[in-house]
């Protein structure tokens, strides 16, 4: 508040400035300050039924200042307003009210929501997401070779996070099962991660099934139909050896 409150000590005529305290230029016993020293703001403070003049370096909370040629004067904002530009335009409301277009409201209008940090009514912001990025290579346990069935993932970014009342964001990860014609891992290739390998076009006849929630899929076990018993695996090895062309397409 930076108060420099002038009060009189002994009885004087209102227009006499000697004996005024603080920032008062002129004062009276009954009304306190009547005018202020240069650059100070004159404000009327209610004390019981009485209004007392005070001189301040700036206007207190709930008041705004006008610098007239002959006096700097504090004027009260509206009752529900803590800081205002003038009588019409509040810039900060008192506790329990929300600011909207210069007015203080109990509740925000339809289509707006209360920001409890700024105590203002703001537009509802809905989630915005980017387009999906391309599918990752088909991998199993981090490898792109030595298997037939694996999973591939794609992601998208959140462009705009939603506000409290905004629409929630849709999933940003999507995982699906993928199938490749199995290829043996080369010597130095065993631990190579999918993202380090060059992507190629998927094989014809690949079957894929998208599952939007990646987290649930990552932790899930293979379903029974996807398990290969020992006999089928042996059969497959024989067939692979008989093939004259080895298919090395990795998806």
């Amino acid at each position: 508040q930076n108060a420099s409150r002038g009060r009189r000590q002994r009885r004087m005529h209102p227009n006499v400035s000697q004996g005024c305290q603080g920032g008062c230029a002129t004062c009276s016993d009954y009304n306190g300050c009547l005018s202020c020293k240069p650059r100070l703001f004159f404000a009327l403070e209610r004390i019981g039924m009485k209004q007392i003049g005070v001189c301040l370096s700036s206007c207190p909370s709930g008041y705004y200042g006008t610098r007239y040629p002959d006096i700097n004067k504090c004027t009260k904002c509206k009752a529900d307003c803590d800081t205002c530009f003038n009588k019409n335009f509040c810039t900060k409301c008192k506790s329990g009210f929300y600011l909207h277009l210069g007015k203080c409201l109990d509740n925000c209008p339809e289509g707006l929501e209360a920001n409890n940090h700024t105590m203002e009514c703001v537009s509802i912001v809905h989630c915005e997401v980017s387009e999906w990025n391309p599918w990752s290579p088909c991998t199993k346990k981090g490898k792109t070779c030595g298997f037939k069935r694996g999973t591939e993932t794609r992601v998208r970014e959140i462009i705009q996070h939603p506000s409290a009342k905004g629409n929630l964001c849709p999933p940003t990860n999507e995982t699906r099962k993928c199938t490749v014609q199995r290829k043996k891992c080369q010597k130095g290739e065993r631990g190579k991660k999918g993202r380090e390998r060059k992507r190629k076009k998927p094989n014809k006849g690949e079957s894929k099934e998208a599952i939007p929630d990646s987290k649930s899929l990552e932790s899930s076990k293979e379903i029974p139909e996807q398990r290969e018993n020992k006999q089928q695996q042996k059969k497959r090895k024989v067939q692979d050896k008989q093939k004259s062309v080895s298919v090395s397409t990795v998806h």
Partner: antibody, heavy 116, light 107 residues
Framework: EVQLVESGGGVVQPGRSLRLSCAAS????????MAWVRQAPGKGLEWVAT????????YFGDSVRGRFTISRDNSKNTLYLQMNSLRAEDTAVYYC?????????WGQGTMVTVSS | DIQMTQSPSSLSASVGDRVTITCLVS??????FVWYQQKPGKSPKLLIY???RLQDGVPSRFSGSGSGTDFTLTISSLQPEDFATYFC?????????FGQGTKLEIK
Amino acid sequence: EVQLVESGGGVVQPGRSLRLSCAASGFTFSDYDMAWVRQAPGKGLEWVATIIYDGSRAYFGDSVRGRFTISRDNSKNTLYLQMNSLRAEDTAVYYCTAHDRSFDYWGQGTMVTVSS
Amino acid sequence: DIQMTQSPSSLSASVGDRVTITCLVSEDISNDFVWYQQKPGKSPKLLIYAASRLQDGVPSRFSGSGSGTDFTLTISSLQPEDFATYFCQQSYKYPPTFGQGTKLEIK
């Protein structure tokens, strides 16, 4: 709805006088400082005078001080501008406006032409 | 008196353009600053007060910024109804002073 309606403009000879009026409605007139702002043809805005809410003090722009007086009648919700010793450079549209640091409400304006 | 230097004095732009008008003030006025819009034959209308706060009914494509001595009015995407003259005003102290105005015309 706030309304400010100016009247009293017209053509007047240099050196003569004119009195403008402004009838206010739709807001608490006695709570507001009131002002006159003018705009010469094709030019910008120029503050002319302000009278505080209770009529006890008035302030004037340098170009009109000593020639113009501003007054108000809060019982009639009316603002006045008495213009004396008019000059050619006083030719402008005169707007009545509620002045509370910014000029929040404006009338439609009344044209004053000073010409011989 | 506080001097206001508004620029440019006129500006040609097309619908959809982003335009910026600036006002330089001769002394520090904090955020005691206002923008008005005036259409031909009409009275001015308060657009922005306290340097950045939109008056009720003013579209959100209008924005104001600045504090101290440098102030800016921006229209993010010009609409046909925005072609008008814009004035700045300091509300820091008497006498109230205005910028010279910026006439925004269709290119």
